[in-house]
Interface confidence: medium
């Protein structure tokens, strides 16, 4: 006997569906109607045939009352080939729901998204996360998706993007977006970051995550942020192979005074990199390759500095007179 594709937990809080059959019984998902968190994985299926069974152009207002009654706040949809028209149909219906967080992962969106009809209402999401989602429309995908969303989006995460750069002239500003996460786009690089950070489109960003994005130097990132007018309070550059030295011909970059937290952990650093902000509240240099305690003048003025997991602090590799600072606990680096 094949296992049930959908499982609802005892609290009716979380419901997970894995549709792996070639001809899945989609009606099984109805047991998720009482859940707050819903995950639907479609096993890599092509949902094109679905279009024949639903009227993607039907007025979604007819479903408004039913959809409003759903408890779902977080929805994850993964592993499918989805026609853009079907995605739009789903977004139009979900606009009447209380959905706040939407995650799309391992999806291939085919075709182009039609423009938002004048009478349609956008989806009032606070968080949108995309991982390994490819769009047939190339660089204009964000602008196309954005018109189906209300302008209150606070968190946007785009990982493993096939086109992490956006068509900036088509993108509207994200006035409420405080967190932008472009992590896990190893091909992005500093030039790609400049292209992705459309100038003046992200005026409210406080947290910017760029883990594993092919960044090379803090100074190069500083230049990209300055060019875009982006002034985060917190910047995560961990899991990049950072160079400690700055190209002497590169112009000096003045970091925004708004930046107070910088994560440079797991960056392969053998010394504290040049060109850091003059003053920080938090600096994370853990799990690098620092062979000695940094001299104060190599560091910004900082209230909270993390150095765990560097060779000079690991028991057995401590320098003379430096063992007294070791806790004996080696962090998992």
């Amino acid at each position: 006997t094949t296992p049930e594709p959908c499982e609802l937990d005892d609290e009716d809080f979380r419901c997970v569906c894995n549709f792996s059959e070639p001809q899945p019984d989609w009606s099984e998902a109805f047991q998720c109607v009482s859940a707050v968190e819903v995950e639907i994985h479609a096993g890599g299926l092509n949902l094109e045939p679905f279009l024949k069974r639903v009227d993607a152009d039907a007025d979604p207002r007819q479903y408004a009352d039913t959809v409003k009654a759903l408890r779902v706040r977080r929805l994850t949809v993964g592993a499918a080939q989805v026609p853009a028209q079907l995605l739009v149909g789903a977004l139009r219906v979900l606009a009447y729901s209380r959905l706040k967080e939407l995650t799309l992962e391992d999806l291939k969106i085919t075709g182009t998204m039609p423009p938002l009809p004048l009478e349609a209402t956008g989806l009032a999401l606070s968080s949108l996360r995309l991982r390994n989602v490819s769009w047939a429309t190339g660089r204009s995908w964000l602008a196309e998706l954005q018109q189906w969303l209300k302008p209150g989006l606070k968190v946007l995460s785009i990982a493993q993007a096939h086109s992490p750069a956006f068509s900036c002239e088509q993108v509207r500003a994200f006035p409420a977006l405080t967190s932008l996460d472009l992590s896990d786009n190893p091909g992005l690089g500093e030039r790609g970051l400049m292209a992705a950070l459309c100038p003046h489109k992200f005026p409210a960003i406080q947290n910017l995550a760029l883990r594993n994005t092919g960044m090379e130097t803090p100074t190069g990132v500083c230049a990209a942020l300055a060019a875009a007018g982006v002034q985060p309070h917190s910047l995560d550059l961990s899991h990049n192979s950072l160079r400690a030295t700055v190209n002497p011909s590169a112009p000096r970059c003045m970091w925004s005074s708004a930046l107070n937290s910088l994560n440079l952990s797991f960056a392969g650093l053998e010394q504290v990199p040049k060109g850091l902000p003059a003053k920080l509240r938090v600096l994370d240099l853990s799990c690098n390759r620092l062979n000695r305690a940094p001299q104060p003048d190599e560091l910004p003025e900082v209230d909270n500095l993390t150095l765990d997991g560097n060779p000079f602090l690991v028991p057995g590799t401590a320098l003379p007179h430096e063992g007294s600072m070791n806790s004996g606990v080696v962090p998992a680096c």
Epitope: A293, Q295, P296, D297, D303, N304, L305, T306
Partner: nanobody
Framework: QVQLQESGGGLVQAGGSLRLSCVAS????????MGWYRQTLGDQREMVAT???????RYADAVKGRFTISRDNAKSAVYLQMNSLNREDTAVYYC????????????????WGQGTQVTVSS
């Protein structure tokens, strides 16, 4: 918490000498630039002399050839030998140090001592 303790100030005749000492204590990891600054009543604090970890010293023009700054890295200490003192050297002398230290986590910032009074009489 980190503290800088100065000593050696006092009253001295013009042409005389004094040696100021300053020791940093607390959970110190390393000490970068150390130095001495002075302030007379109603004036700005001015740099007298500074010395980096490697022992490279810088002096204000007014004290060159008369004052000598030195440091002991093992003791996290800095010293100022003041010779040929004159009335213009009367001031409160402050020790300054750039310190990487450990509290709950590490931190790096500039610290100042409480100051020691040097009075040169004629």
């Amino acid at each position: 918490q980190v503290q800088l303790q100065e000593s050696g100030g006092g009253l001295v005749q013009a042409g005389g000498s004094l040696r100021l000492s300053c020791v940093a204590s607390g959970n110190i990891r390393s000490v970068g630039d150390m130095g001495w600054y002075r302030q007379t009543l109603g004036d700005q604090r001015e740099m007298v002399a500074t010395i980096d970890y490697g022992g490279v010293a810088r002096y204000a023009d007014a004290v060159k050839g008369r004052f000598t700054i030195s440091r002991d890295n093992a003791k996290s200490a800095v010293y100022l030998q003041m010779n040929s003192l004159n009335r213009e050297d009367t001031a409160v002398y402050y020790c300054n140090a750039d310190i990487l230290y450990k509290s709950d986590s590490y931190a790096r910032r500039e610290f100042w001592g409480q100051g020691t009074q040097v009075t040169v009489s004629s």
